[in-house]
């Protein structure tokens, strides 16, 4: 009742390992680290064998099957590259993610590499199977902005690509009788989000109620340069229309806004966000050169067929941009308390301009950013967002513009996208 | 085309409670606050409160405050107002107007008497 | 809280005739930051409900006869009715929405 030797397969052994095999004797089949137990097409750990009553064994030895990952998962924004030859992805072979640079970047920077386990399973060192992060870039033009040493206080065309967090926000608010037709700017912060003024994306009643539009009456257009050639911008509707549950109409204090995109948009040399500062009640320094972008509205009356189509001459087509400084808060608060009316600049404001006048934000829309470089991270950082002026034309002499100081709603602004600040440390400026 | 339809008249004894309605009709209901409006017989009108349907926000005036309850039924597109305590000073022509007073209903009379 | 206060309380004119009445409130109801005035004036006529004719001092409601007109800045306002028709009889009020809203006393036109 002797059953015949038995040969291990090739990467695995058998145990236990007997010179002969007698009736009811029994075998186990295993293999090599890497390898799993193939048997009728079937991957398993082991495989239990039987001498039986004849002299025969229950089975066939079964083969052992190197272990397979198979093809990785992809990964948004960014690419795969194989390391092994002939793109294995069999045990031990190593892949490595990498982002979509230079509009994304990897999460805590990690490395990428995945190795393919004995489990069948692409591993990361640091984050085990879960696939890392590829998050947008923040506040790098791929078009170099100009020195700002230069004083320029006229607008200049910017180039495509120069201010690639500017959007173009509409709203048409056809609840409102007759229905309402305006217009503003924003900020991409991510390519879900965009930050602008409430004032922008507040229901222009006839009373002072602060009620937002309605989600389906804004539209929002990046990458936007020419307003007579929207064919290469990016258009989107809003998932969501959030603005501060203090928002003041009367004062225009905490004057800030988010519009959550329908679709995330894809980002590109065209269409990048910028960065947020750091929670700072101090804001941007006095003196310090920003600049703000828009289309230079002329006329608030302007129509949205008269903004989208060409030929107008509400606001400019290109979009321009003009550098401004930081003025001395007490400066600023001064200037405006000389005046007749409500002029109130709180701490949650800036103001920016130039003594002698000349050009200011009516170069920008309401809600633009102001972008201040920030030469720690390298990075351009929204400090500020269009918000008010003085009763005169703009330009004048000692009418400041006034912003909204965005460095005091960062927390604000982090809850409202449902991202904890820790996991979008590189958007935030370092 | 846009309606607001009020609630029939109402004869109620003093210190009873009155509940008149003001049904919306022909644009988005949650676009838009209800405001409420008093009108005793030949006086001037009174402005009592609002309430915004989207998220049931309401502002009163400070006269109205114990007076009246705003609510909304967004699956009815129906505003609500309730008057407690009623005394003959309640007694008057009572208005629902929506999309910032462009439409008004055609009011409910509310006769407060023993 | 803002008091509105309407003058005169009633008046009469011949049809045809130019009409002015006017509000006045207790404190500015011009917003610096959007520019507008929260001034408007309605019309009652006897048995109806209010209708508004003209918004944010004087911008004039759609459908509204262009002989209303809304004028005044701050706390000075004015309502011109400047050829009256007969189906002008009615009283005309005026409301703040600057802060919550107020309605004045109204204007009772009579016509002779």
């Known amino acids: 009742n002797e059953c015949p030797e038995l040969q291990p397969p090739v990467h695995g052994k058998i145990e236990p390992s007997q010179a002969k095999y007698f009736f009811k004797d029994q075998v186990l089949v295993s293999c090599d680290t890497g390898y799993k137990v193939l048997k009728d097409n079937v991957e398993m750990d082991t495989f239990q064998i039987e001498c039986l009553k004849d002299g025969t064994w229950s089975n066939k030895i079964p083969t052992c099957k190197i272990v397979d990952c198979r093809a990785p998962g992809e990964l948004e924004h960014g690419l795969i590259t194989f390391s092994t030859r002939n793109n294995l992805t069999t045990y031990k072979s190593e892949i490595k993610y990498s982002c979509q640079e230079p509009y994304y970047k990897m999460l805590n920077n990690n490395t990428g590499i995945y190795t393919c386990s004995a489990q069948g399973v692409w591993m990361n060192k640091v984050l085990g199977r879960s696939l890392p992060t590829c998050l947008p870039e923040c506040g790098q033009p791929s078009r170099s902005l100009p020195s700002l040493v230069k004083r320029i206080i006229g607008g200049r065309n910017a180039e495509p690509g120069l201010f690639p967090w500017q959007a173009l926000i509409v709203v048409e608010d056809t609840s409102r009788v007759p229905n309402d037709k305006w217009f503003g700017s924003g900020a991409l912060l991510s390519a879900s989000w965009i930050l602008t003024a409430a004032h922008v994306l507040r229901s222009q009643r006839r009373d002072t109620t602060v009620i937002p539009v309605s989600k389906e009456h804004v539209t929002v257009y990046l990458g936007l340069h020419d307003v007579r050639d929207k064919s290469g911008a990016v258009n989107s509707s809003a998932a969501r229309v959030v603005l501060h549950p203090d928002f003041n109409i009367q004062n225009y204090n905490h004057d800030i806004a988010l519009v959550q995109l329908q679709e995330p948009v894809p980002l590109g040399p065209h269409v990048m966000p910028v960065c947020l500062p750091r929670l700072e009640p101090e804001g941007p320094a006095p003196h310090m050169l920003g600049l703000v972008a828009g289309w230079g509205i002329s006329n608030p009356n302007v129509t949205v067929d008269e903004i989208i189509s060409s030929g107008t001459r509400t606001l400019s087509d290109v979009l321009q941009y003009v550098k401004l400084p930081v003025v001395p808060h007490a400066e600023c608060k001064t200037s405006y308390e000389s005046r007749s009316g409500n002029y109130s600049v709180t701490e949650n404001m800036f103001c920016a301009g130039y003594y002698e006048g000349g050009k200011d934000t009516c170069l920008g829309d309401s809600g633009g950013a102001f972008v201040i470089f920030d030469d720690l991270s390298q990075r351009w950082v929204v400090q500020g967002l269009v918000s008010w002026g003085g009763p005169e034309e703009c330009g004048s002499k000692q009418v400041y513009g006034v912003y909204t100081k965005v460095s005091n709603y960062v927390d604000w602004v982090w809850e409202q996208m449902g991202l904890p600040q820790s996991v979008v440390e590189p958007q935030v400026e370092r | 085309q846009v309606q607001l339809k009020q609630s029939g008249p109402e004869l109620v004894k003093p210190g009873a409670s009155v509940k008149l309605s003001c049904k919306a009709s022909?644009?988005?209901?949650?676009?838009?606050?209800i405001n409420w409006v008093k009108q005793r017989p030949g006086q001037g009108l009174e402005w009592i409160g609002w309430i915004y349907p989207r998220d049931d926000r309401t502002k009163y005036n400070d006269k109205f405050k114990d007076k009246a309850t705003l609510t909304v039924d967004t699956s009815s597109n129906t505003a609500y107002m309730d008057l407690h305590s009623l005394t003959s000073e309640d007694s008057a022509v009572y208005f629902c107007?929506?999309?910032?007073?462009?439409?008004w209903g055609q009011g409910t009379l509310v006769a407060v008497s023993s | 809280d803002i008091v509105m206060t309407q003058s005169p309380s009633s008046l009469a004119v011949s049809a045809g005739e130019k009409v002015t009445m006017t509000c006045k409130s207790s404190q500015s109801l011009l917003n610096s930051r959007t520019r507008k005035n929260y001034l408007a004036w309605y019309q009652q006529k006897p048995g109806q409900s209010p209708k508004l004719l003209i918004y944010?001092?004087?911008t004039r409601e759609s459908g509204v006869p262009d002989r209303f007109t809304g004028s005044g800045s701050g706390t000075d306002f004015s309502l011109t009715i400047s050829s009256v028709q007969a189906e002008d009889l009615a009283v005309y009020y005026c409301?703040?929405?600057?802060?919550?809203?107020?309605f004045g006393g109204g204007t009772k036109l009579e016509i002779k």
């Open positions: 022909g644009y988005t209901f949650t676009t838009d606050d």
């Open positions: 409301k703040q929405s600057y802060n919550l809203y107020t």
């Open positions: 944010w001092a004087s």
């Open positions: 107007s929506s999309l910032e007073d462009t439409y």
